[in-house]
């Protein structure tokens, strides 16, 4: 129940905290667990433990084992168990899954990457970090404290980052490398009642007879992806397909994205060789989803020739 | 945050038990730490009345030790106090606590409990 | 049992001084290099809040003016400089053994 799994490569420093936390100060014994030897406290062993912390300065594979540590109260002693596992260095770039801390998630407004563990450590910055083994370059990459920031997140940014750094002990420097991976995702999106671009609310649209005319429903519903959102045309409250005037046709325009980020959806209306009935129509430019329906209406005008002369 | 919410009654009848509720929230009372009851008498006085571990190992005052029993409902994540043939001895306010290690960290707000007839 | 005296009973403080209170242990509390005496304050119609844990150190987000110290059977917080939102009772517990007790309480009252 109180057990935590540990790793890290030989020749590299691990420092392991007692799964069983008590509060700084308590005094804390650490013991190996098959053979119930107590761990030294002095810091001349290559192992030894020191409060809450066992620290393997430097680790070996032979290391590897469950550690048990008792955090000691005269009335309630706590036990937690610390299985560590130190690896051998691989030869090649691949990092194998069992080496690999969880995996964080990022987007363009939270592209922070922390590296694992370092909270543990006595290190100084500046990190190193690197992505697939290669060293990050470019002022896109900022090491700041204990974590890797990128600008302008894209998703080939996903991968694996691996965080380099020095820990010491003593005036003694001991490498240690942390690697996870890092996902790229959308920025969380939301949804709004539509809102109606266009047209204006009881717009009057000049048209001339017999000349074609286009009609634009544009309206946003949020950002990101958008679960229910639509836009139509009606003609006198019934459906453009219902209506059975085969001059009259709605053509599906681009999704947009402006540049504020909103998820917005075009419906062009065509209106082919307009005729004096058509300026009789009432003309809803629908917009849709869950929050609700938004209607805005337009009614076709004449347009003057005179008007069309000047 | 762990947060501790008291509930039962105000008035006991003398020689009747006295039985309080402690509904934890934010954590769960198996996973780790004591759960206790403390009472403050009214001349200020605090009493450590017994604790159940998240084990569901009691320990209790052996002041009380004959007439106290601290339970729990995993399920609905609460402990109980239960103090039987109460006197007006027992009149106080009645808190739940949780012992991380020696300290009580998180407290109730308390229950103002009388014994009267 | 272990009983634990405090004293002063009550005890009056001009803002900016410093508030000593003591707790006295009818046994050593001290063992394996730990001092198992802790500290809570508590205000009016309010829990006990903790202060100090194991003699001298300040539990999280308790300001630094707290300080506690002491081992064995004799231990002492300290309050400086006071504060108006000292106003409190001061109470003293240890965890040696079997039963948890409390001290009588300490109330710190402002001139």
């Known amino acids: 129940k109180f057990s935590k799994q540990s790793w890290g490569l030989e020749n590299e420093a691990l420092i392991v905290r007692c799964p069983r936390q008590g509060k700084p100060s308590y005094t804390v014994d650490w013991y190996y667990s098959q053979t119930n030897k107590s761990i030294p406290t002095q810091e001349r062993n290559r192992v030894f433990a020191s409060g809450q912390l066992l620290k393997f300065l430097p680790a070996a594979v032979a290391d590897s084992g469950i550690y048990t540590c008792i955090v000691r109260s005269p009335t309630f002693n706590r036990t937690g168990y610390a299985n560590v596992t130190i690896y051998k260095k691989q030869s090649d770039c691949n990092v194998p899954d069992y080496l690999m801390y969880s995996t964080v998630s990022g987007s363009e407004k939270n592209s922070k990457i922390y590296c694992p563990t370092i909270d543990l450590y006595n290190w100084t910055a500046p990190l190193e970090w690197f992505k697939n083994c290669q060293a990050l370059q470019g002022s896109r990459y900022r090491a700041h404290k204990s974590f890797l920031v990128i600008d302008n997140v894209m998703t080939e940014d996903a991968g694996d980052y691996t965080c380099k750094f020095i820990h010491n002990e003593n005036g003694a420097n001991y490498s240690v490398t942390a690697t996870r991976s890092f996902t790229v995702k959308d920025e969380q999106g939301f949804s709004l009642f539509p809102v109606i671009g266009a047209p204006a609310q009881n717009e009057i649209k000049e048209v001339e007879i017999g000349k074609n005319a286009n009609l634009t429903c544009s309206a946003c519903f949020g950002k990101g992806t958008q679960f229910l959102a639509a836009v139509l045309w009606q003609l006198n409250g019934t459906k453009i397909t219902d209506f059975g005037e085969p001059r009259i046709q709605q053509e599906e325009g681009q999704n947009q994205s402006f540049s504020n980020g909103l998820a917005c959806l075009d419906m062009v209306l065509r209106i082919a060789d307009v005729k004096e009935e058509d300026l009789l129509l009432q003309y809803d430019c629908l917009a849709l989803n869950l929050h609700g329906l938004r209607r805005h209406t337009v009614r076709l005008s004449r347009k003057n020739p005179i008007d069309h002369h000047s | 945050d762990v947060q501790l919410q008291q509930s039962g009654p105000g008035l006991v009848k003398p020689s009747q038990s006295l039985s309080l509720t402690c509904t934890v929230t934010g954590y769960s009372i198996t996973s780790d730490y004591a759960w206790d009851w403390i009472r403050q008498f009214p001349g200020n006085k605090l009493e450590w009345m017994g604790y159940?571990?998240?084990?569901?190992?009691?320990y209790y005052n052996p002041s009380l030790k004959s007439r106290i029993s601290i339970t729990r409902d995993t399920s609905k994540n609460q402990f109980f106090l239960q103090l039987n043939s109460v006197t007006t001895e027992d009149t106080a306010t009645y808190y739940c606590?949780?012992?991380?290690?020696?300290?009580?960290?998180?407290w109730g707000q308390g229950t103002s409990v009388t014994v009267s007839s | 049992d272990i009983v634990l005296t405090q004293s002063p009973a009550s005890l009056t403080v001009s803002l900016g001084q410093r508030a000593t209170i003591s707790c006295r242990a009818s046994?050593?509390?001290?063992?394996?290099?730990?001092?198992?005496m802790h500290w809570y304050q508590q205000k009016p119609g309010q829990p006990p809040k903790l202060l100090i844990y194991?003699?001298?150190n300040l539990e999280s987000g308790v300001p630094a003016r707290f300080s506690g110290s002491g081992s064995g059977t004799d231990f002492t917080l300290n309050i400086h400089p006071v504060e108006e939102e000292d106003a409190a009772t001061y109470y003293c517990q240890h965890s040696r053994e079997f039963p948890l007790t409390f001290g009588a309480g300490t109330k710190l009252e402002l001139k």
């Open positions: 606590a949780t012992t991380m290690m020696d300290t009580m960290d998180y």
């Open positions: 159940i571990r998240y084990s569901g190992d009691t």
């Open positions: 194991l003699a001298s």
């Open positions: 046994k050593s509390v001290s063992t394996s290099g730990n001092s198992y």
